[in-house]
Amino acid sequence: EEELQVIQPDKSVLVAAGETATLRCTATSLIPVGPIQWFRGAGPGRELIYNQKEGHFPRVTTVSDLTKRNNMDFSIRIGNITPADAGTYYCVKFRKGSPDDVEFKSGAGTELSVRAKPSAPVVSGPAARATPQHTVSFTCESHGFSPRDITLKWFKNGNELSDFQTNVDPVGESVSYSIHSTAKVVLTREDVHSQVICEVAHVTLQGDPLRGTANLSETIRVPPTLEVTQQPVRAENQVNVTCQVRKFYPQRLQLTWLENGNVSRTETASTVTENKDGTYNWMSWLLVNVSAHRDDVKLTCQVEHDGQPAVSKSHDLKVSAHPKEQGSNTAAENTGSNERNIY
């Protein structure tokens, strides 16, 4: 009779993570008597996957009933496959011996490859806000995929970016891989509504590439422009001075009026108007009773935006240009929350 051969018909098997792998093995003879064992890898460091005779292997089931006397099918199924299960599996026939069974013949091996989807890309931006014209870095990370081949693209508002660096780790063979990419983006004043998108494509993805996004509204700071103007006289001896705070983002803003360098009033931006580009406008106004002043008045609108150093704009109020009421140095009534009389 011909000597027993161990046949592993599949040179390679490909399985998706989470699925079940079937590793086929048949023997050509019932002789010699002895068990079958499955190993991952060869040599002294090989890992026992299944032992027909003894042991507990919860993820492994046999395709056939190995207790049947004439069984020659030693195929196994391994459940809930992960990338860590990748490797070459050997079906090994042992000859019954005393005290230990002796390895008799091994199959040629079946290489198990595992395909695993990349995790959803996570995009993160800089810790601190930056202003237009500055370059900021965004990072994108995705993990757990196999095989290693993957493509990553960056977009800003649908336009592909070219200034980025990508690494897939580890460099050598591994059960699964991670990708890390850093893109440089130049901010513009119009970027409040902009989005940065990281797009990852992999062989396992049946849909479009996976996308991770970051809103530039969380990254950008658009400093305000200030304009202080003197409005036409509202009533005799009264001048309305306004401070237009334009095109700022985010909304966090505090405004202080100074009269000849002295603090007159401080207020926080509340009822702002939003521009189409996502920036905000706000206006504060001051009612000045010029009859209370003998000299010219320097009015300063000082704005502290998003915790940054204050910016200011001044306006000189020419008192001489207004006829004064003799002996009048009392203030006009405060007529609104945004009105302030200067004494």
């Epitope: 490909l14 399985v15 998706a16 290489e111 081949d149 049946q206």
Partner: antibody, heavy 115, light 109 residues
């Protein structure tokens, strides 16, 4: 299974739409592709549509074909056929393990474009 | 686009013999290569994917191998039913596009 329909004798310049009908699986779970084979020639890739409905085309297509889908069918519109487009058109589904191969093919539908 | 060069265009072998078909990619395709069998008037049938993985139900007489740019389909113990045209097909993970080889006609004597 997948099956193509709509193949017929057409005239140059007159749009023609082929339909691929699937059963036993959902188009929302798999990438689907269109291929063609001119008489006596080899297989040629036209384009795919992703599970979410985005089409991707071979570089030579240049607007000559449009791929779209509904919940159970995928269409290939020949926008302005020429005699060179005479071929058997196949639709196919990618494998469950990845988009690098096609494991389910239709029997094909013959399109003849003639003056 | 990647060009797939398949050789030979035609091969003849006897029943029980062995046939080897080669496919060369214009650049590395990282084992993303499939082999199909097509008989006249029929649809293509997937034999092998990811260079060497046998599709379910396909006899182990069909063997795929190779990596990088060079791939091989070996059919051993030829049967008359193996008479067909065989195509290789690549997928390029960067361009996410597909390409076919020109085909090899296998004649079984």
């Amino acid at each position: 299974s997948v099956e193509e329909s709509g193949g017929r004798l057409g005239t140059p310049g007159t749009p023609l739409t082929l339909t691929c009908t699937v059963s036993g699986f959902s188009l929302s779970s798999y990438v689907m592709g269109w291929f063609r084979q001119a008489p006596g020639k080899g297989l040629e890739y036209i384009g795919i549509i992703s599970s979410s409905g985005s089409p991707y085309y071979a570089s030579w297509v240049n607007g000559r074909f449009t791929i779209s889908k509904t919940s159970t069918t995928m269409d290939l519109k020949m926008n302005s056929p020429t005699t060179e487009d005479t071929a058997t058109y196949f639709c196919a589904r990618v494998g469950p393990l990845g988009v690098d191969y096609f494991n389910i093919w239709g029997p094909g539908t013959l399109v003849t474009v003639s003056l | 686009d990647i060009v797939m060069t398949q050789t030979p265009s035609s091969v003849e072998a006897a029943v029980g013999g062995t046939v080897t078909i080669k496919c060369q990619a214009g650049q590395s395709i990282n084992s993303y290569l499939a082999w199909y069998q097509q008989k006249p008037g029929q649809r293509p049938k997937l034999l092998i994917y990811y260079a060497s993985t046998l599709e379910s139900g396909v006899p182990s007489r069909f063997k795929g191998s190779g990596s990088g740019t060079d791939y091989t389909l070996t059919i051993s113990d030829l049967e008359s039913a193996d008479a067909a045209t065989y195509y290789c097909q690549s997928w390029h993970y960067i361009s996410r596009s597909y390409a076919f080889g020109g085909g090899t006609e296998v004649v079984v004597k």
